[in-house]
């Protein structure tokens, strides 16, 4: 089955923006929202934002979590507000964080 093609006039969503790429803004607009977690020298760095171009998020959002990085994507206004990306933890989850699974 072919990957879904982007629409000519794609819907843009408002997303929460938290992280290095956000500047002074706390939101951004794009075709997909994301919530990510990366491990930098053993420290958890959480980011949220948007992919403004469909192709930009296409591969990233399909990448399964690894021990050093996880990304959760969604489509809908502010849909990443309550999403916390999590690393695979062999059946255990970190205390104080939410589990989120894409259907």
């Amino acid at each position: 089955m072919e990957d879904e093609k982007p629409k000519v006039n794609p819907k843009l969503y408002m997303c929460v923006c938290e992280g290095l790429s956000c500047g002074n803004e706390d939101h951004c607009e794009g075709q997909q929202c994301f919530s990510s977690l990366s491990i930098n020298d053993g420290f958890h760095v959480y980011q949220k934002g948007c992919f403004q171009v469909y192709e930009q998020g296409k591969m990233t959002c399909k990448t399964p979590p690894s021990p050093g990085q996880a990304v959760e994507c969604c489509q809908g206004d502010w849909c990443n507000r309550n999403i916390t990306a999590q690393l695979p933890t062999k059946g255990k989850s970190f205390p104080g964080t939410q589990n989120f699974h894409l259907e």
């Epitope: 420290f43 958890h44 970190f94």
Partner: antibody
Framework: EVQLVESGGGLVQPGGSLRLSCAAS????????MYWIRQAPGKGLEWISS????????YYPDSVKGRFTISRDNSKNTVYLQMNSLRAEDTAVYYC???????????WGQGTLVTVSS | DIQMTQSPSSLSASVGDRVTITCKAS??????LNWFQQKPGKAPKLLIY???SLQTGIPSRFSGSGSGTDFTLTISSLQPEDFATYYC????????FGQGTKVEIK
């Protein structure tokens, strides 16, 4: 109550080795990343190592890479720091610390002093 | 590595004073910054995480602000137990501490 208790410090000659231990209690040890931070006498703080929950990923700054090794034993709720090829500049109080995923270095042990001198 | 520059390196203040300590990062670290308090012979104690979140059990006279490269720790009304050394710490990349700010009694 979270408790982190370091041990194993002492006097060692330059070029020598030492293994520090940090015994943890009051939380589910195997769920948390652990860290070592040091502080030379009268100086500031320096992060020197991190380890993930299962011990499979370890991290070091260049200043100790190749000489220090962090490890953990989740069955004993203990994290270790093996220090080899010690130098005078490694003289410091060594602290063990833990994070929660959202709060880096939330808890610290009381520290153990390592003195490297001939 | 990201350099963290704290200022001032030391300051003298009186009980009841408003005290401000700044930390400047050599590059953008967003809000990935903590503040610690350390007293002589003791381990550092976390005061503020994620730039402006107050750690549980820390008095509300402590507050943090900033994003990007410029950060501030403020003690709204200095208390006798606040005389200590304060460190900022960034974990955006290559974790590093500031050099410390010693708060002394005037």
């Amino acid at each position: 109550e979270v408790q982190l208790v370091e041990s194993g410090g002492g006097l060692v000659q330059p070029g020598g080795s030492l293994r520090l231990s940090c015994a943890a209690s009051g939380f589910t040890f195997s769920n948390y990343y652990m860290y070592w931070i040091r502080q030379a006498p009268g100086k500031g703080l320096e992060w020197i190592s991190s380890i993930n929950t299962d011990g499979g990923s370890t991290y070091y700054p260049d200043s100790v890479k190749g000489r220090f090794t962090i490890s953990r034993d989740n069955s004993k709720n203990t994290v270790y720091l093996q220090m080899n090829s010690l130098r005078a500049e490694d003289t410091a109080v060594y602290y063990c610390a833990k994070s929660t995923p959202n709060i880096p270095l939330a808890y610290w042990g009381q520290g153990t002093l390592v003195t490297v001198s001939s | 590595d990201i350099q963290m520059t704290q200022s001032p390196s030391s300051l003298s203040a009186s009980v009841g004073d408003r005290v401000t300590i700044t930390c400047k990062a050599s590059q953008n670290i967003y809000k990935y910054l903590n503040w610690f308090q350390q007293k002589p012979g003791k381990a550092p104690k976390l005061l503020i995480y994620y730039s402006n979140s107050l750690q549980t059990g820390i008095p509300s006279r402590f507050s943090g602000s900033g994003s990007g490269t410029d950060f501030t720790l403020t003690i709204s009304s200095l208390q006798p137990e606040d005389f200590a050394t304060y460190y900022c710490f960034q974990y955006s990349s290559g974790p590093t501490f500031g050099q410390g700010t010693k708060v002394e009694i005037k």
